[in-house]
């Protein structure tokens, strides 16, 4: 089948880098600068992706293969491949339209990318806050506060009780 | 092919002025929001404003506020940016940026941006 095809189409004899040239007998030239082929048998080469302003390249283009972008220090990639570049925040801010603003009180936000997130309720599931909350950091929760007893310490949980007269196992 | 070009910046004084313009082709101007981004030598890319479809709605960064304004002309496919009273720490190159499909929804994310023009404060 092979051998069929390239007697009925020259251009499948092509390789990656080239492209089979029509303006001259469909013989294999190669790409032109800052276009790229990354499989045989192509009539055309595509233009390589161009990484400015806010991308930045990655990996140059080659003959065979396509230029890969990231973002400029100070944004961070969206998208499949890197087709956009984002805004980084502090952290303890979230990105608006307006640009970086502070979380409101009761959310955070660890990271410079995201949006910032309600601090953990840990009445939900019985515990107490043992260490509060701040723009960039979540709640702390400890234990609930029925085991916070007098004397009892706020971190480590009280030992098991025992019946009088039974040494320890 | 969608291409952003863009032009004015130069060399000025401080409390010196300059409009920066950004020729947008290849694709519909009045669809997307846009940008000016900026990076300082030696800085990473900072955020300076950006405009929306209509020119309704804009909004800059602290430092500019008051001294620069970010305008469009979706007739001339233009965008601009007006910076007044400029200072030392505005020196940097300017770009222009379209804001993706979805920007300001789903995402701040900027598809495509120039090469850039350089402004330089100093006396």
């Known amino acids: 089948f092979e051998r069929t095809r390239s007697l009925q189409d020259p251009c499948s004899n092509c390789p990656a880098g080239t492209f089979c040239d029509n303006n001259r007998n469909q013989i294999c030239s190669p790409c032109p600068p800052n276009s790229f082929s990354s499989a045989g048998g192509q009539r055309t080469c595509d233009i390589c992706r161009q990484c400015k302003g806010v991308f930045r390249t990655r990996k140059e283009c080659s003959s065979t293969s396509n230029a890969e972008c990231d973002c400029t220090p100070g944004f961070h990639c969206l998208g499949a491949g890197c087709s956009m570049c984002e805004q980084d925040c502090k952290q303890g801010q979230e990105l608006t339209k307006k640009g970086c603003k502070d979380c409101c009180f009761g959310t955070f936000n660890d990271q410079k990318r995201g949006i910032c997130r309600p601090w953990t309720n840990c009445s939900l599931d019985g515990k107490s806050v043992l260490v509060n909350g701040t723009k960039e950091r979540d709640v702390v929760c400890g234990p609930s506060p029925a085991d916070l007893s007098p004397g009892a310490s706020s971190v480590t949980p009280p030992a098991p009780a025992r019946e009088p007269g039974h040494s320890p196992q | 092919e969608v291409q952003l070009v863009e032009s004015g910046g130069g060399l000025v004084q401080p409390g010196g002025s300059l409009r920066l313009s950004c020729a947008a082709s290849?694709?519909?101007?009045?669809n997307y929001w846009m940008n000016w981004v900026r990076q300082a030598p030696g800085k990473g890319l900072e955020w300076?404003?950006?405009?929306?479809?209509?020119?309704?709605?804009?909004y800059y960064v602290d430092s500019v506020k008051g001294r620069f304004t970010i305008s469009r002309d979706n007739a001339k496919n233009s965008l601009y940016l007006q910076m007044n009273s400029l200072r030392a720490e505005d020196t940097a190159v300017y770009f222009c940026a379209r804001g993706g499909e979805g920007y300001g929804v789903d995402h701040y994310g900027l598809d495509v941006s120039g090469q850039g023009t350089t402004v330089t404060v100093s006396s």
């Open positions: 300076v404003a950006n405009i929306n479809q209509d020119g309704s709605e804009r």
């Open positions: 290849g694709f519909t101007l009045s």
